[in-house]
């Protein structure tokens, strides 16, 4: 379902990744050098920035993100 | 700098009303939600709800629905919380404190209120 | 309701002591974790946010870590101004919900 609206409630922040907040809404996301193999599947839907540098991604599927705007 | 001034001590008697002021400083005011805490003498910290300035809008903790009431007046800049049909178990710390992606920055000095008869 | 556990609930260290306190959460909180430091008469201030972002002008020794439903927050070199009370706070459902708290001692 989705999020109630609060400013009390933290957004989505894939497991191990660095996250910051950008703004009332979104969410700025590092998830840099983690040795990942695949991308983080909890992404939230208010996600404005994503780093996936320095990782093990060799290929994306067709709409890896469905889940961001 | 940030700063959310509240109200002074106040003292009061069981089935009376406290309004607690939380006037806000060095922010725009409508941009940041803002939130309501109490602490019980030696107790811990309870999320009593929040407001979002720029159209009132609000969330209670279940616990704190009804005799709690949340409110704004923007052109002050300030945050209300009014409680009524006080009981002693409502003797705590009140706190404001500011909000925006889930997290609360700059707190209040908080406000004592004291009900006894 | 998210419940939150912290331990201990207090603590004596010594200044130059590294210092570890838990909060466990009752259910999968995601990362959505902060960290607050409390002090008689001052201000609540915020420490960490999202488990492990540190706030603006928070020293380097505190750091947060932690996932699923247990997190701890770290204090490397404990300095004279450190004792104080510390809560951990949940923001993955509403209520937002707070730790017992610990509250640091000087040995």
């Known amino acids: 379902g989705s999020s109630p609206r609060s400013g009390v409630l933290l957004r989505g922040c894939p497991t191990h990744c660095h996250c910051e907040p950008d703004g009332r809404m979104l969410l700025r996301v590092d998830c840099s050098d983690l040795g990942l193999s695949e991308l983080p599947s909890n992404l939230s839907v208010f996600t404005s920035y994503l780093d996936l540098s320095m990782n093990n991604i060799s290929q994306l599927l067709p709409n890896p993100l469905p889940s961001l705007r | 700098q940030v700063q959310l001034v509240q109200s002074g001590s106040e003292l009061k008697k069981p089935g009376a009303s406290v309004k607690v002021s939380c006037k806000a400083s060095g922010y725009t005011f409508t941009n940041y939600w803002m939130q309501w805490v109490r602490q019980a003498p030696g107790q811990g910290l309870e999320w009593i709800g929040e407001?979002?300035?720029?159209?009132?809008?609000?969330n209670y903790n279940q616990g704190f629905t009804g005799r709690f009431v949340l409110s704004v007046d923007t052109s002050v800049s300030t945050a209300y919380l009014q409680i009524s049909s006080l009981k002693a178990e409502d003797t705590a710390v009140y706190y404001c404190a500011r909000s925006l992606s889930g997290y609360v920055d700059y707190w209040g000095q908080g406000t004592t209120v004291t009900v006894s008869s | 309701d998210i419940q939150m556990t912290q331990s201990p609930s207090s603590l004596s260290a010594s200044v130059g002591d590294r210092v570890t306190i838990t909060c466990r959460a009752s259910?999968?909180?995601?990362?959505?974790l902060n960290w607050y430091q409390q002090k008689p008469g001052k201000a609540v201030k915020l420490l960490i946010s999202?488990?492990?972002r540190l706030h603006s002008g928070v020293p380097s020794r505190f750091s947060g870590s932690g996932s699923g439903t247990d997190y701890t927050l770290t204090i490397s070199s404990l300095q004279p101004e450190d004792f104080a009370t510390y809560f951990c706070q949940q923001g993955n459902s509403l209520p937002p919900t707070f730790g017992g708290g610990t509250k640091l001692e000087i040995k």
């Open positions: 407001i979002d300035p720029s159209d009132s809008y609000t």
């Open positions: 999202y488990r492990s």
């Open positions: 259910q999968d909180i995601s990362n959505r």
